[in-house]
């Protein structure tokens, strides 16, 4: 056969679908690899061909589009399963070709089993809600194109294993789930089950996402430096190890780039002839506020080092702050020598 532009196996499209549910999979060629869409390709006389390689097999084989009830079908650039079976797992290839042109890409499809509480190996999308921020909604994802707008599906929402009804601050509203005031207790997995009829059959779509309640932008503040502070003095003798922690609290701010750094006499430690090491650790609170600690360490401090200015800086999308550490040389304790003077006075 003639040369074909092979885009390889596109693992970015690691598609996971639930067993015994409908699945519609668009050929990734038109979304990510080619500069034209399916309609343009079709009107230019190009044909879209599908084939697959079963799990743990090397042999490419055509997809059987003659199964009972049209279980697998193709419509334009979409491959349909109505519904999926476990052994549909494999690598699927869509190829666009005519006599002079050929382009193809493969992608993995994994058919996943779920238990009665919707637990499965499915990778779950995460939706962040701001804590105590007013009404916020999540929408049942990836259900577009499964049924026409004339069809009115029934939607049931679950938190974990429990159907959401008469919950205090969570209200199902069709495809949306409204959180009147999000709290930490709302963290968890939420599932919508969409049920719709098609050609005398009933299909279910199950979609689960993780809700994570995070700090609200209303409460966000510039970074707060907890250490160094005015209450702690780093008093050292030459030859001792100097350790100064810089501990900074950052409010959660979506996508903010948080950073902490030290300057010594206004310069980066690298720009000074001094043997400094800096170790960093990062921790997060339940609402994803961040605490960064950077420990500045000088193994054997000199008297010159103890005269330098050590400043911790922090910056986030909310602002920038800096704080100097109080460093001083320990004054040696006076040595008391007892002098006994014996005086003999003659009168």
């Amino acid at each position: 056969s003639e040369r074909c532009d092979d885009w390889g196996l596109d693992t970015m499209r690691q598609i996971q679908v639930f067993e015994d549910e409908p699945a519609r999979i668009k050929c990734p060629l038109f979304e990510h690899f080619l500069k034209f869409n399916y309609s343009t390709a079709h009107s230019a006389g190009l044909t879209l061909i599908w084939y697959w390689t079963r799990q743990d097999r090397d042999l490419e084989e055509p997809i059987n589009f003659r199964l009972p009830e049209n279980r697998i079908s193709k419509e334009k650039d979409v491959l349909w399963f109505r519904p999926t079976l476990l052994n549909d797992t494999g690598n699927y290839t869509c190829m666009l070709r005519n006599t002079t042109y050929c382009s193809k890409v493969a992608f993995p499809l994994e058919v996943v089993q779920k238990d009665s509480c919707f637990n499965s190996p499915m990778k779950l999308p995460v939706h962040k809600l701001y804590i105590e921020y007013g009404i916020q909604r999540i929408t049942c994802p990836n259900v577009d194109g499964y049924f026409p707008s004339s069809v009115k599906p029934t939607i049931t929402w679950y938190m974990g294993c429990y159907k959401i009804q008469n919950f205090n601050n969570v209200i199902p509203e069709g495809m949306n789930l409204s959180f009147l005031i999000a709290l930490i207790s709302n963290n968890g997995n939420y599932t919508c089950v969409v049920t719709y009829p098609e050609n005398g059959r009933t299909f279910h779509l199950t979609r689960t996402l993780t809700v994570k309640v995070v700090g609200s932008p209303k409460n966000a503040v510039p970074p707060v430096i907890h250490s160094p502070n005015d209450h702690v003095v780093y008093e050292k003798e030459p030859g001792e190890e100097l350790l100064i922690p810089c501990t900074v609290y950052f409010s959660f701010l979506m996508d903010s780039r948080n950073e902490v750094w030290w300057t010594i006499d206004g310069k980066k430690p690298d720009d000074i002839t001094i043997d400094v090491t800096i170790n960093e650790s990062i921790s997060h609170s339940r609402t994803e506020d961040e605490t960064r600690t950077q420990i500045l360490s000088i193994k054997k401090v000199t008297s010159e080092d103890l005269k330098r200015s050590y400043v911790c800086h922090a910056r986030s999308a909310k602002g920038e702050v800096a704080k100097a550490a109080k460093v001083k040389q320990k004054v040696p304790a006076p040595r008391y020598t007892v002098e006994l003077a014996c005086g003999f006075g003659a009168t």
Epitope: S256, R257, E259, P269, D270, I278, N279, E280
Partner: antibody, heavy 111, light 106 residues
């Protein structure tokens, strides 16, 4: 080492640093397309425990560092023709700009 | 994500002329950084934290701006200033660059 890769293939870039305290710097990879557009690809914290990626490479590329050997890596998988670019490793101290850029390594993705 | 739009994309100036190029951010950011690149070389830091000149950058360069509007100015264009200038933001992930302004010598 850059080079040529087929679509869907893999490649590993490395960058060796010298002349500065490697662990003091946040390291990044930035690429420049043939059309000369600059695009940030990934960033790694000083200790290596925190990584950040651009949406275009999330799930396909992995940034890592070996502080003992002053080395930065970019493992590229499922590469596409859009990944064709000159890849630069860069360093940044604190929240400041990328104050030094490597000489770059060329990556071409083509079947 | 923050989109940085640089204008003009290409400009030319005569020696001694004043040059201003701009960088507009789609949302408010804390600072902008500028890089300069000459053909066949890596980008070099040029102006950091909006207005600070990197070491070795001539005093005829200056940077200013805040929020969503930033600019780089050369008060006296010289032949060696012909290059491409990129703006860059590191306030939010993903970090982003402008499309560049190519400055040519007239």
């Amino acid at each position: 080492g850059g080079g040529l890769a087929k679509p869907g293939g893999s490649l590993k870039l490395s960058c060796t640093a010298s002349g500065f305290t490697f662990t003091s710097y946040v390291m990044s990879w930035v690429r420049q397309s043939p059309e000369k557009r600059l695009e940030w690809v990934a960033e790694i914290s000083r200790g290596g425990s925190h990584t950040y990626y651009s949406d275009t490479v999330t799930g396909r590329f992995t940034i890592s560092r070996d502080n003992a050997n002053n080395a930065l890596y970019l493992e590229m998988s499922s590469v596409r023709s859009a990944d064709t670019a000159m890849y630069f490793c860069t360093r940044a101290y604190g929240n400041s700009e990328m104050d030094f850029w490597g000489q770059g390594t060329s990556v071409t993705v083509s079947s | 994500q923050i989109v940085l739009t640089q204008s003009p994309a290409i400009m030319s100036a005569s020696p001694g002329e004043k040059v201003t190029m701009t960088c507009s951010a789609s949302s408010s950011i804390s600072y902008i950084h500028w890089y300069r690149q000459k053909p066949g070389t890596s980008p070099k830091r040029w102006i950091y934290d909006t207005s600070n000149l990197a070491s070795g950058v001539p005093a005829r360069f200056s940077g200013s701006g805040s929020g969503t509007s930033y600019s780089l100015t050369i008060i006296n264009m010289e032949a060696e200033d012909a290059a491409t200038y990129y703006c860059h933001q590191r306030t939010y992930y993903p970090l982003t660059f402008g499309g560049g302004t190519r400055l040519e010598l007239k």
